[in-house]
Amino acid sequence: LSLEGSRTLTVCPGSVQPLSSQTLRASSSAGTDPQLLLYRVVRGPQLGRLFHAQQDSTGEALVNFTQAEVYAGNILYEHEMPTEPFWEAHDTLELQLSSPPARDVAATLAVAVSFEAACPQRPSHLWKNKGLWVPEGQRAKITMAALDASNLLASVPSPQRLEHDVLFQVTQFPSRGQLLVSEEPLHAGQPHFLQSQLAAGQLVYAHGGGGTQQDGFHFRAHLQGPAGATVAGPQTSEAFAITVRDVNERPPQPQASVPLRITRGSRAPISRAQLSVVDPDSAPGEIEYEVQRAPHNGFLSLVGGGPGPVTHFTQADVDSGRLAFVANGSSVAGVFQLSMSDGASPPLPMSLAVDILPSAIEVQLQAPLEVPQALGRSSLSQQQLRVVSDREEPEAAYRLIQGPKYGHLLVGGRPASAFSQLQIDQGEVVFAFTNFSSSHDHFRVLALARGVNASAVVNITVRALLHVWAGGPWPQGATLRLDPTILDAGELANRTGSVPHFRLLEGPRHGRVVRVPRARTEPGGSQLVEQFTQQDLEDGRLGLEVGRPEGRAPSPTGDSLTLELWAQGVPPAVASLDFATEPYNAARPYSVALLSVPEATRMEAGKPESSTPTGEPGPMASSPVPAVAKGGFLGFLEANMFS
């Protein structure tokens, strides 16, 4: 990797300057795509900030950018005007350039912020040169709010600053009035005044009457050392504008402004809703607007004018629909800082806000809402509802357009059909079952964010409060006891004060659930079971006949039972018992109670009995006794005592 470019950036005070390829240019010997040349900001600027033209200029500091973004002019340095005047200031950015597998390269970008530079954004080289408004035939003080050369003084080291001043030499006097210093008029023989006199409020302009034409004066300002000596240092020649206004003039009154809402990359006319004034003594064409500061999300243009941005326009342009805002690719809201004047009153600041609407939004549903069975309710989170456009939309609002069938949504404990993303994020939006007849539900919402909407369906499932056995494989052809070591809804029983019951929805593919007789004296054999209770499990009355996969040689396989679990006062839940099976191995200790073992095993042990079809468990096993773990051995003996 190599870095070229000057690595210096000159910025006008208070302005935004893009980084360019002249400033910062990286290349690699491999001819890497500029998109893959990544800069990391190790240490950001101190006197301003670095941001991306098409991302939030008010958000967090920029951390990464690419050479391609530099080429596109999208990486901007904005100098933030300090409260204290300065003549020249220096800032640095420490960057690290990387593009694997090449080694990282460190770079420092020097930023010079100077009033010396020629700045199109600010024609004056002084801290302030704002001009003056004076009523016809009257006088007005020229204060440091209007004219201030403190930045020239700031070029002197602070210990010597008190001994210095700024001398203003008037090179062209006002034509319609007089300048006075301490009530003494300035003239060709005495054409000077000092910054210190300005600061003391001693400079006055007195208008001579006889019309409201513009006035002003030209001057040269430079540093003056101790005892009035001229010293080397910054200097400037400029004009100070004086506007004379009619004493009967009523200033224009700005009206409340509605933000312009526009989708990114599009064009929209500015109307009186965005910019209008009430001025009884001016025509719309006389009310002029000047753009003082433009946002980074687009520009103003005039129909019939050039394609580029305009900085001056009139109320007539607005009223006729000639003024338009052209949005660029940025998704960030912005504000135009404008000044408005009727040419006869001091300019008034105005602003025009531009909201960039997403062209589309998407409701992201990362997971269904899982409701714990014993609670019957659950808070929604960003996992269920989150709106994104070209960014996350934290101010999204939601409205139910189709409610849940088996429950309702509550905000703060009361049923609600509308809620916000903030309420979701704070855990205030809850779904609660009110009808306990389904293990699933769903609702449809309409999400609204920045004027755009989208709908989505949130699915709801109930998470069973059931402890399910997870262990080694079960023997094919055997009947094992289904008991609380395998399925246990005891906690649900305790929480609801009821006896949970199960309904078999599906499975097993190979085998069946049966009710086993307590003793040989009970009539009949095993009965097929489709429903049972927690009590049945605890009583050991249930068996699972583990079948063999049909039509192939015995081999390990997977199987499952899908159950619906019900209890009083809570929604039902679907759960599954997944288990692995393998051909029976008499030498293996199985961690479940076996009520019978496969027929073939008994034959091999020298006790021939009538065989049963493959996959159908035979009668209760008698002898030899297979190894059964965890008390299953005693259970096995008990079950077979009378065989």
């Epitope: 019957g376 509550l410 009361r414 049923p415 059909s417 009110t434 306990f436």
Partner: antibody
Framework: QVQLQESGPGLVKPSQTLSLTCTVS?????????WNWIRQHPGKGLEWIGY???????NYNPSLKSRVTISRDTSKNQFSLKLSSVTAADTAVYYC?????WGQGTLVTVSS | DIQMTQSPSSLSASVGDRVTITCRAS??????LNWYQQKPGKAPKLLIY???SLHSGVPSRFSGSGSGTDFTLTISSLQPEDFATYHC?????????FGQGTKVEIK
Amino acid sequence: QVQLQESGPGLVKPSQTLSLTCTVSGGSITSGYYWNWIRQHPGKGLEWIGYITYDGSNNYNPSLKSRVTISRDTSKNQFSLKLSSVTAADTAVYYCADFDYWGQGTLVTVSS
Amino acid sequence: DIQMTQSPSSLSASVGDRVTITCRASYGIRGYLNWYQQKPGKAPKLLIYYTSSLHSGVPSRFSGSGSGTDFTLTISSLQPEDFATYHCQQYSALPWTFGQGTKVEIK
């Protein structure tokens, strides 16, 4: 705040259908969640009859389900109760209510 | 259906008394309980929702508490305008059900 007002005949003959309407002001019936009908037999407790929701779905008290219909007219911002095959046991003050606010109630007497 | 049982069915108290009314559900209602006040010939008015949340405009002398199946409405200092019948109602499971009411009378 939302205001509710019941209207309908105060006297209904046995075996006929009781019909009441609730007019909602200060809010839309497409935004409030539940729009309920509740009744109170003279000197007795309150009995929930059923509701219609913002999206037009219903739920009824199982004890009355076979005889009840609750519908709505969004253009008029109203919802209605129909209770068929009434008997003297249906004599009560009938209220319409959302979650927070109730109408003042209307007494319906079932008598020939 | 969830049965709601209020106790006592009536009570006599004086102005300034602390009054407690209880409501028991036949099984857990997850806190989804409202309390209403009803005066003769008038419609019920919501006082408390979701066990303990005070409805807007309701004086702070009214408070609610409880969980699971047992809930309480407390009037910290009874005022003349509080003599009325009080009803609890669950909205945890359909059908919504009410208690039979507790009448608070002047002693």
